[in-house]
Structures are given as C-alpha cells and as structure tokens.
C-alpha cells in the first residue's frame, strides 16, 4: 500500500532534495529557502534563482523551506514559570525551561508548567530530580506518599489508599484507644 | 472556602456555539490564572484553555484554536468559554480550575457542566 501524501509533499516529490515544484508551473523545479529565510517570489524559470528573503525580527525559520511566511517566535510563558533558555534567531525559535531545581510537566504536547522538585522530607530520594521528572521519594516507617510528600501516617484516614502502608500505625492507633475505656 | 460553579453547557449542534460561565468565590480571582479542562467519557482530562489574571495572552489547545475564546471578567469574579463551531468531538465535562501551584494535580476545581455536541 502507498501511504496517502497532501497535495505539497505530492509536488514536492517530484523534485529533487533541496527544490520543489513551481506551484503554477509543474515542469520547473525551484531551489528551496534557506533556514532564516522564507519565500518571498518563486523562481521565474529552470536553473534561475528563487526570491527568498530573512525573517524579520520575532520571527524565523528553522529548516529549508518554501514558506510564505516566517514563524512566529514562541513566548516563555510566565505564568506557568517558564524561563528563556535561549533567544529567538532567525533560525531558531525560543527555548524555554524551568529554574534549577524544577522540573517540566507537560500538560500536553506543546504546553509545560515548572514545579520545585520534592526534597522528601521524612523519606529519601529514590530517584533524582530531573528535566521533565519530579524526585521519586521513598518514605520512611510513619510515613506514605501523598502527592509527592511524606505525610506522617496520623493523617491517614481508614478510606484512603495510605491504610496498606500505615495498617501497624492504624492497628497501634485503634488499640491505644480501646485500652483507654473500661 | 474556594468554589467554581461552571454554568452554560448543554445540547448542541454541530456547528453550533455555547458559552460557559464559571463563578469563583472564596480566594483573590484576580491574582489567579484560571484554567478551562474538559474530559470526555471513559478519556483522562484534556488541557482546553488558559487565561493569565490580566487576560492577557491566553493559550489554547491545539483541538480548539480558533474556535473557542476563553475570557474573565475580574469585576465579577467569573471565567468564560465561547465555543464555537461544535464539533462531535467536543462532547466532555468542562470543568473550570484554579492553575496547580504545587505539583500537577487541580486542588480546586469545579464539578463541571456537561457539554453534548449531537445532532
């Protein structure tokens, strides 16, 4: 089965790497945009040069192409504690990160907010803090993980999740208090 | 006490609009950037929109861009969704959120109002 191509990667293939097919002349074959720049006039005819002309400011291209126009730079999102790692170029769009000890949770696919990474306290790091990852915390004896935290197992009610890991505690709980009535 | 009450959902069309409501009490509205999600049956949650507390600059999925418009009026504590041009797969609860400080999870957010795109 061939897989099914749009319209552009159709025309594309017909030229070879680097070129792509004038759009209202199929027999001519036009030199690609440089990363940086993006077409401004195809080329008037085989062998002759296309138009093609640099991104302006706030914008850019980061591949060869035959672009109408340039991409807009992305902004870091304050909000969601995002950082500029590094500065939108003609040929690059910004990078944007998290601060030193935060790491990336992506909501979806083009979308991250920056979190402090858990110190686990009451327990210990199981696995570093890292890029697009929070700590993993094991916790000590008393304690169980509550949404990355280690939360001491008197707060730990008989519905939640928390009984398996704190039952001795809960046992120790429960029989101090029959003790306590006659 | 923090509270969300989505409003404004209902049946619709294909093609169709709706606009849905959220009345914040019980914490400073207009310091917080407020989040629109959505989660349709038997799917995990879906980030639908945000908006920052000056408005400015809001973000949109990429399902949704250009059809929906999220906005907040800091005046009377509430946050809006204009949807427009409905589309089968947009059938979910929305449920209007406080934007996570603390980790990735929604410590406040509402019960929802349910959304069906049908015809």
């Known amino acids: 089965l061939v897989p099914h191509l749009g319209d552009r990667e159709k025309r594309d293939s017909v030229c070879p790497q680097g070129k792509y097919i004038h759009p209202q002349n199929n027999s001519i074959c036009c030199t690609k945009c440089h990363k940086g720049t993006y077409l401004y006039n195809d080329c008037p005819g085989p062998g002759q040069d296309t138009d093609c002309r640099e991104c302006e400011s706030g914008s850019f291209t980061a591949s060869e192409n035959h672009l109408r126009h340039c991409l807009s730079c992305s902004k870091c999102r304050k909000e969601m504690g995002q950082v500029e790692i590094s500065s939108c170029t003609v040929d690059r769009d910004t990078v944007c990160g998290c601060r030193k000890n935060q790491y990336r949770h992506y909501w979806s696919e083009n979308l991250f907010q920056c979190f402090n990474c858990s110190l686990c306290l009451n327990g210990t790091v199981h696995l570093s803090c890292q890029e697009k990852q929070n700590t993993v915390c094991t916790c000590h004896a008393g304690f169980f993980l509550r949404e990355n935290e280690c939360v001491s197992c008197s707060n730990c009610k008989k519905s939640l999740e928390c009984t398996k890991l704190c039952l001795p505690q809960i046992e120790n709980v429960k029989g101090t208090e029959d003790s306590g009535t006659t | 006490e923090v509270q969300l009450l989505e409003s404004g959902g209902g049946l619709v069309q294909p093609g169709g609009s709706l606009r849905l409501s959220c009345a914040a009490s019980g914490f400073t509205f207009a310091h917080e950037t407020m989040v629109w999600v959505r989660q349709a049956a038997g799917k995990g949650l879906e980030w639908v929109s945000h908006?920052?507390?000056?408005?400015?600059?809001?973000f949109y999925a990429d399902s949704v861009k250009g059809r929906f418009t999220i906005s907040r009026d800091n005046s009377k504590n509430t946050l809006y969704l204009q949807m427009n041009s409905l589309r089968a797969e947009d059938t979910a609860v929305y449920h209007c959120?406080?934007?996570?400080?603390?980790?990735?999870?929604?410590?406040?957010w509402g019960q929802g109002t349910l959304v069906t795109v049908s015809s």
């Open positions: 959120a406080l934007l996570p400080k603390r980790g990735p999870w929604f410590d406040y």
């Open positions: 908006i920052p507390p000056d408005g400015q600059d809001p």
